[in-house]
Interface confidence: medium
Amino acid sequence: FERTRSLQDPCSNCPAGTFCDNNRNQICSPCPPNSFSSAGGQRTCDICRQCKGVFRTRKECSSTSNAECDCTPGFHCLGAGCSMCEQDCKQGQELTKKGCKDCCFGTFNDQKRGICRPWTNCSLDGKSVLVNGTKERDVVCGPSPADLSPGASSVTPPAPAREPGHSPQ
């Protein structure tokens, strides 16, 4: 018995979660365990992503959708679909080739990822430093010195570091 080929590809009738099995006369077969097809008309099912090591499973694989991974505590996702996990640092630090390093004087990072950035130069806007910067926080700029009432004082901003070498976002 020779199967008559219709004008329409018979595989187009196979729904998501199945594949068009050439070994079984183009019958729609369910995806095997640990595989999926997210669209209809597929001739193969894709292998499910496995979240191993520093990756952990955020969403289990199903017959119609791939698994989704995120990162274990102490790491954060990078890349489309969390393709990589990168080490967290503490606030006040940034990740360098040699690991987490404290922000240099005059720079800060208020996140667990990203880079250390120079403190804002309040004087550029004609303002004064209201609150000093730290490794974890930018300075807070206040009114210009001329706006301060007599007797009021303002913290003197430190000289800018000549090597901001560290910076985040």
Epitope: L78, G79, M84, E86, L95, T96, K97, K98, K101, R113, G114, I115, R117, P118, T120, D138, P160, A161, R162, E163, P164, G165, S167, P168, Q169
Partner: antibody, heavy 121, light 109 residues
Amino acid sequence: EVQLVQSGGGLVQPGGSLRLSCAASGFTFSDYYMNWIRQAPGKGLEWLSYISSGGSTIYYADSVKGRFTISRDNAKNSLYLQMNSLRAEDTAVYYCAREDYGGNSVLFDYWGQGTLVTVSS
Amino acid sequence: SSELTQDPAVSVALGQTVRITCQGDSLRSYYASWYQQKPGQAPVLVIYGKNNRPSGIPDRFSGSSSRNTASLTITGAQAEDEADYYCNSRDSSANHFYVFGTGTKVTVL
């Protein structure tokens, strides 16, 4: 689709002013640091300034410090560069660029189309 | 003068391999990102970090890093790879925050 669409370039006399705009779409603008980068005719890329996602942290290259002002309006998904006291050496194509961080490096993952600023009398 | 130094120009035969280097003190601590720029167009990110490619960038582009040098390698160069390539990292002085390399013109023969 992420898009950065620039406007505001043109011809200006030395000592004059110009304001460049960069309209963002296709992403959550308020989540990202934004940058301005320029390229003089036939020359390489020069980084000019960044502004933090909320607008509170700003940094400038020495070449434009005190003359250029970067700002943003997150409600309008827009980035701006106010350029004052323009000089002939400021003639360049100006790009806005979205900044991201990954793999222990800073990256400019999306760029505007560029806008030409010509400073000449 | 830029703090990231690149060779001004290199040429490569179609289908062969070319390596572009970028040298600078800041690269001892930080990885570079790499940008391709064709005439009249905005730059496009091709490599960042140790060796990460944004989606849509062909796998013939790869990156590596050693001491104060970052490298971009194009394995099996295609005609459409002819462009200027710039590295970028942080500055090691306070004059700029980010700095671009001087740029390398890649010609595919």
